[in-house]
């Protein structure tokens, strides 16, 4: 059903990284506008992005209220300039999104190595604890706050003169690794949620190498 001059949205897709969550869809509107609604499985529908000509809607504010809930969205199509018009069944045309559970599905953003410090044959590598848009008591939570021990980091490290990458893992944001004295090392980290079956890993952080600005060397 629907009015003769509107088409239903299609290819509804969730795009989410570190809980910043946008619903995208097609087609680009021609003589029509869209409104999005979102709800949890048991909740009421809430309207967002009223009568927009965009083909995306930022739903972050809604999903961060409870990132472990499962959400459903729908996109309504209305004729441009006649948004009260309804389809033959008395309702505007709409299409449902796939279900989306932020805690299980949001992509992990690219991590950043905050610092590294060498003390003798040990190097301490610290990963930046990225802030998310999830709030508790009016403060924004970090990725570690949200995921706790579910989130681990894998460190890849290698001698500047070699290609083989050793690995280390931590469920904090710090690594303490053994290195050979007098050798320069490079580092890259990856965020991982091992309990997931999809979207388990982030892209790798930019590579940081000893002898560059971020690090500090102390001879003991």
């Amino acid at each position: 059903s629907g009015t003769t001059n509107t088409v239903a949205a299609y290819n509804l897709t969730w795009k989410s990284t570190n809980f910043k969550t946008i619903l995208e869809w097609e087609p680009k509107p021609v003589n029509q506008v869209y409104t999005v609604q979102i709800s949890t499985k048991s909740g009421d529908w809430k309207s967002k992005c009223f009568y927009t000509t965009d083909t995306e809607c930022d739903l972050t504010d809604e999903i961060v209220k409870d990132v472990k809930q499962t959400y459903l969205a729908r996109v309504f199509s209305y004729p441009a300039g006649n948004v009260e018009s309804t389809g033959s069944a008395g309702e505007p045309l709409y299409e449902n999104s796939p279900e989306f559970t932020p805690y299980l599905e949001t992509n992990l953003g690219q991590p950043t190595i905050q610092s590294f410090e060498q003390v003798g044959t040990k190097v301490n590598v610290t990963v930046e604890d990225e802030r998310t848009l999830v709030r508790r008591n009016n403060t924004f939570l970090s990725l570690r706050d949200v995921f706790g021990k579910d989130l681990i980091y894998t460190l890849y490290y290698w001698k500047s003169s070699s290609s083989g990458k050793k690995t280390a893992k931590t469920n904090t944001n710090e690594f303490l690794i053994d290195v050979d004295k007098g050798e320069n090392y490079c580092f890259s980290v990856q965020a991982v949620i091992p309990s997931r079956t999809v979207n388990r890993k982030s892209t790798d952080s930019p590579v940081e190498c000893m002898g560059q600005e971020k690090g500090e060397f102390r001879e003991i």
């Epitope: 681990i152 890849y156 893992k169 053994d178 991982v192 091992p194 309990s195 388990r200 890993k201």
Partner: antibody
Framework: EVQLVESGGGLVQPGGSLRLSCAAS????????IHWVRQAPGKGLEWVGY????????YYADSVKGRFTISADTSKNTAYLQMNSLRAEDTAVYYC?????????????WGQGTLVTVSS | DIQMTQSPSSLSASVGDRVTITCRAS??????VAWYQQKPGKAPKLLIY???FLYSGVPSRFSGSRSGTDFTLTISSLQPEDFATYYC?????????FGQGTKVEIK
């Protein structure tokens, strides 16, 4: 169902080459790390090397460094072990195994293995 | 590289016996030790991870423990299907390393 299937084993002369494949199903290899482990006849398990298919990073055991190369084709969901300059002591059953990359991260799934025999 | 020294290399036991296999790491590996069971002509199967956690589907007669750098696999009451070779493995650092294996045979 998670499955790893190795293929490509066989008889090869010393100094020869062979490429083993590890075809994965039931999961996406780029979400995990893939290891190769070998077992000489009547002997124990020896780790050969790993690849992280998401970035191509690898590391090898000293015994195969410079001779073996691990690669992955994420579009085929398959990892490979290219073995060059083969020696009699490389004769073994070769297994690929999945590493869930958790803190406790052992190898949770293994293939059935493929036998490589290096002999003249 | 971290060495995993496993003992004994073989043992004979009867059905119903309590069996203990030990592995000593050459340096600290925290709890990053796994135990595998392997039967002839088959791939290894994961039994215990993180030193003491039973992998899904593994019978509760298998257990693991840690004391410092010493790790123990215990089979509380040996069953006919438990005759196999057992390996410990550390995955704390690269490269991961295996113990030499313990063959459990029928007495």
């Amino acid at each position: 169902e998670v499955q790893l299937v190795e293929s490509g084993g066989g008889l090869v002369q010393p100094g020869g080459s062979l490429r083993l494949s590890c075809a994965a199903s039931g999961f996406t290899i780029s979400d995990y790390i893939i290891h190769w482990v070998r077992q000489a006849p009547g002997k124990g398990l020896e780790w050969v090397g790993y690849i992280d298919p998401s970035n191509g990073y690898t590391y090898y055991a000293d015994s195969v460094k410079g001779r073996f190369t691990i690669s992955a084709d994420t579009s085929k969901n398959t990892a490979y072990l290219q073995m060059n300059s083969l020696r009699a002591e490389d004769t073994a059953v070769y297994y690929c195994a999945r590493d869930p990359q958790s803190l406790t991260s052992p190898f949770d799934y293994w293939g059935q293995g493929t036998l490589v025999t290096v002999s003249s | 590289d971290i060495q995993m020294t496993q003992s004994p290399s073989s043992l004979s036991a009867s059905v119903g016996d309590r069996v203990t296999i030990t592995c000593r790491a050459s340096q600290d590996v925290n709890t990053a030790v796994a135990w595998y069971q392997q039967k002839p002509g088959k791939a290894p199967k994961l039994l215990i991870y993180s030193a003491s956690f039973l992998y899904s589907g593994v019978p509760s007669r298998f257990s693991g423990s840690r004391s410092g750098t010493d790790f123990t696999l215990t089979i509380s009451s040996l069953q006919p299907e438990d005759f196999a070779t057992y390996y410990c493995q550390q995955h704390y650092t690269t490269p991961p390393t295996f113990g030499q294996g313990t063959k459990v045979e029928i007495k």
